[in-house]
């Protein structure tokens, strides 16, 4: 970068090289060039020569002033116009950064995806800081009082093998960058309560000719958890509103769920499960599409035919007779 150049002087920033976005800053350039009393000192930002707000302080030093600096990153360098030199002489350069101190991390969540061998912890980091921000995840056993710390720049996967202090833990997150440090509230977890069953997948659908045609959705999960509660949501692709069916499920065999649907309409289905009575749900499965036939013949949709684009819709959901807004997160 710009900081690796050979300098014939010095460049510095006040209040600091990393500063809060929107601040007024001063960049100083001091020449130390043999046989040169600089006639002028020039500043460049990202290769563009600066024209305004340059003040000469003394024979060797000039200041560039910026009001309300809003760029996350900039490469600055300065040059001197030396008498009898045809070209400007490079003095020095520096990379500068602006951003924000971290917000208090909130919505700390830790889950164990079945078979993953990891506890995955995530949180809401708050507003974008624009500068390098590190997170330290603290995991403290409530049984042994032993604390472990994990450094990361986003979420963290902690091997369940390393959680040797029993089943109950406190988890909290510390966020830090050059402009500040914040700490989340503590989350109390029990390892048995945060397991999310192996993903449920819709494999195929068929519409069976009967007096009233019915559609059967086939779906399964590799989970070994005995008590699992699931939800399947479905809607016509032209609709905004989801219909939701709830199931208490035993995955010792492939699940078959029956639906009475309108003919000649394209429907979309998704499923998700949780260990019964626990807090966290799986994310909704990939979108599974099935078009019902116009009339009599049998129609089958297979999993490999389904589209996996994300709907991104904020929709309403009908569940056991209550209309609720269904914008729940993946695991909440």
């Amino acid at each position: 970068g710009i900081t690796n150049i050979n300098c014939s002087g010095h460049i510095w920033v006040e209040p600091a090289t990393i500063f809060k976005m929107g601040m007024n800053i001063s960049i100083y350039c001091q020449a130390a060039i043999k046989n040169c009393q600089p006639r002028k000192l020039h500043f460049y930002k990202n290769g563009i020569k600066e024209r305004f707000q340059i003040t000469r302080i003394n024979k060797t030093t000039a200041r560039l002033w910026y009001k309300n600096f809003l760029e996350p990153h900039a490469s600055m360098y300065c040059t001197a116009e030396c008498p009898k030199h045809f070209q400007e002489t490079l003095i020095c350069g520096k990379d500068i950064s602006s951003g924000y101190p971290p917000d208090i991390p909130d919505e700390v969540t830790c889950v164990i995806y079945e078979y993953s061998g990891n506890m995955t912890c995530t949180w809401n980091a708050g507003k974008l800081t624009y500068i390098d921000t590190k997170y330290v995840v603290h995991v403290k056993s409530l049984e042994t009082e032993e604390e472990q710390q994990y450094l990361t720049s986003s979420y963290i996967n902690i091997s369940t093998d390393s959680l040797q202090g029993g089943k109950k833990y406190l988890v909290w997150v510390q966020a830090a960058n050059a402009l500040g440090m914040e700490e989340s509230k503590q989350l109390q977890i029990h390892l048995d309560d945060i397991v999310i069953p192996s993903a449920a997948v819709i494999s195929r659908a068929e519409t069976i000719n009967a007096t009233v045609p019915k559609t059967i959705i086939y779906w399964d999960s590799q989970t070994t958890i005995e008590k699992v509660s699931c939800e399947m949501r479905y809607k016509a692709t032209t609709n905004q509103t989801w219909n939701v069916k709830e199931f208490d499920t035993n995955f010792t065999y492939v699940q078959q769920s029956e639906f009475y649907l309108e003919p000649n309409i394209k429907y979309v289905f998704q499923v998700r499960c949780q260990e019964t009575g626990k807090r966290y749900w799986q994310p909704w499965s990939s979108l599974f599409f099935h078009k019902t036939p116009e009339t009599v013949p049998q129609v089958t949709s297979k999993a490999f035919q389904h589209d996996t684009w994300n709907s991104g819709l904020t929709v309403a959901s009908i569940s056991t007779g209550h209309l609720t807004s269904d914008n729940r997160g993946d695991i909440g």
């Epitope: 006639r39 002028k40 563009i48 020569k49 600066e50 024209r51 305004f52 000469r56 024979k59 008498p83």
Partner: antibody, heavy 119, light 107 residues
């Protein structure tokens, strides 16, 4: 050799607009800063507006007396400098010179064009 | 902006005289000073830049000197074509600013 030819001057009523042009030749136009300097009758020289060279990303400057009324622009493909003058006042009456600067002093000047603002 | 003060505002001299015009800046301008000559109805013409460098084609009777805040234009032997108004310009800090001018008249 360097040549600068201004045009567009004339008599105009207060509040009206005028557009000056300066056709340049004999040098690499985009590499030089271009300015409009005016001289009121019997008075000294005043920098009115400046549009800098490519290395400055064509940054513009305006004297306080013309800010929000005058606009300097350049067309590098035509080697031409412009000054759009709106809401003209009697005190804008002057000879307007187009000038070239590579460093910050004015190396070459046009012959000037007279702008008279009078009702 | 840097203020430039020229003196005298006018002077009368004869052909062959040595003439000195001074320019004072409101702060150190580190030899970033130019001198111009302007004849009636004509555009200004660059004589001196960087306080002491003679522009190509300008007669050697013109010279410039100075440092810090004080600068001088000297015409060693005034010629008939030198009767004109002279302006100094600082280009140390942006925007460049002119002195108010010195009119050199025939005595």
């Amino acid at each position: 050799q360097v040549q600068l030819v201004e045009s567009g001057g004339g008599v105009v009523q207060p509040g009206r607009s005028l557009r000056l042009s300066c056709a340049a030749s004999g040098f690499d136009f985009s590499s030089y800063g271009m300015s409009w300097v005016r001289q009121a009758p019997g008075k000294g020289l005043d920098l009115v507006a400046d549009i800098n060279s490519k290395s400055y990303n064509y940054a513009t400057y305006y004297a306080d007396s013309v800010k929000d009324r005058f606009t300097i622009s350049r067309d590098n493909s035509k080697n031409t400098l412009y000054l759009q003058m709106n809401s003209l006042r009697a005190e804008d009456t002057a000879v307007y010179y187009c000038a070239v600067h590579h460093s910050d002093y004015f190396e070459y000047w046009g012959q000037g064009t007279l702008v008279t603002v009078s009702s | 902006d840097i203020q430039m003060t020229q003196s005298p505002s006018s002077l009368s001299a004869s052909v062959g005289d040595r003439v000195t015009i001074t320019c004072r800046a409101s702060q150190d301008i580190y030899t970033n000073l130019a001198w111009y000559q302007q004849k009636p109805g004509k555009a200004p013409k660059l004589l001196i830049y960087h306080a002491s460098s003679l522009q190509s084609g300008v007669p050697s009777r013109f010279s410039g000197s100075g440092s810090g805040t004080d600068y001088t234009l000297t015409i060693s032997s005034l010629q008939p074509e030198d009767f004109a108004t002279y302006y100094c310009l600082q280009d140390s800090e942006y925007p460049p600013t002119f002195g108010q001018g010195t009119k050199v008249e025939i005595k």
